[in-house]
Interface confidence: low
């Protein structure tokens, strides 16, 4: 109660006190976060000629501007707009690959099928992939101790809002036939609460996107069920159809063989089903 007395007497909000650093439920900012973002940006622009014009210093300044000195439970998509503007990139039609709860396989796929792109193959997704970050209200400090957890603390935290913002943009710019990789091993193959289900599905533009093709990835080698008949897939089909976008679904029974056949399509075993 002594602490409360101090707050009451000075009429200071708890998150304005630098000495009592807010303890959030999530893990803190990734070690060497600024250096990592900058290094990734430099590497990306070196490898992708179409992004060589990007000034990585400006990208970092825009990134830090989105969350530094701001209360980490009150971040908005607006905060990330300067960064989104700097990271503007287009994907050729028919080359967008979305994913839900199966990131590793999606990335393995685009590493082989180099003309298809997940969000993490784009500059902004590449910069932030697997990183955590947050700041503190009214200071220039990065919080390396803890950051807000989406469930336990708040949803409007720097990391969640970033992914919501860039995922929305990624879906909005997609065109032609869009593909999505879904995890057939999960109880909800299509989860309305995932980033794909809550953001990307609703931001595909019917005037640009002719169809969404779902690839349902099977987990077990002996699993021969048609997971395209799963109730959650039917729910996805309903949502997509209502948006005047056609829907197709394919079972990928053997993800290992699937990847192998992407690498070597001429392989005789690839003529049979995968």
């Amino acid at each position: 109660s002594g602490l409360n007395d101090i707050f009451e007497a000075q009429k200071i909000e708890w998150h304005e006190l630098p000495r009592w650093r807010q303890q959030w439920s999530g893990s803190g900012t990734t070690s060497r976060f600024p250096e990592t973002v900058l290094a990734r940006c430099v590497k990306y622009t070196e490898v992708h000629p179409e992004m060589r014009h990007v000034d990585c210093q400006s990208v970092w300044d825009a990134f830090k501007g989105a969350f530094i000195s701001k209360y980490p439970c009150n971040i908005t998509e607006e905060d990330y707009q300067p960064l989104v503007k700097l990271g503007t990139q287009t994907v050729p039609c028919n080359k967008t690959l979305l994913w839900s709860r199966i990131k590793d396989l999606a990335h393995q796929f685009t590493q082989v099928q180099r003309d298809m792109f997940t969000l993490e193959d784009m500059l902004l997704g590449y910069l932030a992939d697997d990183l955590t970050w947050c700041g503190e209200f009214n200071t220039f400090e990065i919080n390396y101790q803890s950051c807000p957890d989406w469930r336990k603390d708040c949803s409007n935290n720097p990391v969640s809002v970033f992914w919501k913002t860039v995922s929305r943009r990624f879906a909005e710019t997609a065109c032609g036939v869009v593909h999505v990789m879904l995890n057939g091993s999960r109880s909800k193959i299509f989860d309305k609460n995932s980033t794909f289900g809550s953001v990307e599905v609703h931001n595909l533009q019917p005037e640009k996107v002719q169809a969404l093709e779902a690839w349902v990835i099977h987990g077990g080698r002996e699993d021969s069920r048609d997971l395209c008949q799963d109730p959650t897939i039917k729910e996805l089909e309903s949502i997509i159809s209502k948006r005047n976008i056609r829907f197709f679904c394919k079972n990928i029974y053997r993800p290992d063989k699937f990847l192998q056949c992407v690498k070597n399509p001429e392989d005789s075993s690839c003529l049979s089903g995968i």
């Epitope: 630098p18 250096e35 210093q57 830090k64 009214n138 200071t139 220039f140 400090e141 390396y144």
Partner: antibody
Framework: QSVEESGGRLVTPGTPLTLTCTVS????????VSWVRQAPGKGLEWIGY?????GTYYANWAQGRFTISKTSTTVDLKITSPTTEDTATYFC??????????????WGPGTLVTVSS | DVVMTQTPASVSEPVGGTVTINCQAS??????LAWYQQKPGQPPKLLIY???TLASGVSSRFKGSGSGTEFTLTISDLESADAATYYC????????????FGGGTEVVVK
Amino acid sequence: QSVEESGGRLVTPGTPLTLTCTVSGFSLSNYGVSWVRQAPGKGLEWIGYILTSGGTYYANWAQGRFTISKTSTTVDLKITSPTTEDTATYFCGRPKDSDSSAFVSLWGPGTLVTVSS
Amino acid sequence: DVVMTQTPASVSEPVGGTVTINCQASESIYSNLAWYQQKPGQPPKLLIYKASTLASGVSSRFKGSGSGTEFTLTISDLESADAATYYCQANHMIVIYGNGFGGGTEVVVK
């Protein structure tokens, strides 16, 4: 509680030099440390900072020219390839309270580095 | 880079007078600014942090104000012991920036 710099001396250009900041009365697991330098008759120049976690920040101009590292009771500043422009008194300092703050309230007396051929 | 511009470079005032030193940041640094006093042959001494908070043991004759990009250090009732060089410093502990210090202001007490 104190900090003290050591290792300053006359070196020839290009010869790496490591300065050491020895702390006592507080733990480097609770406080970060800044390095600041001052050329003769000139102003203060912030070089860099090491966090309790061991993560480092450097000023733009210092990136690649200096390396900061630490043990449990010392913080080292390595001047990778000194030039005559690096002639200065080098100070280390501890922030006023928490890990990640550049405001230095506890300073060492400084150690003089002279780079000359 | 955030650039700190300090004015004037030098100022001379009599004992009992008042000195005002200005520090301008090239972009907003909120209240993340400190003021230091340095005398010849000595390390700097922290006077004020968070733009206006007096460091422990520092006389209340020293007053810091401002936020965003404009900051001021005011020294009232000047004493001969106040003769020194004063520096502002931006505290923005985010990697990739230039020197966080202003160029310094020499205060001469007549």
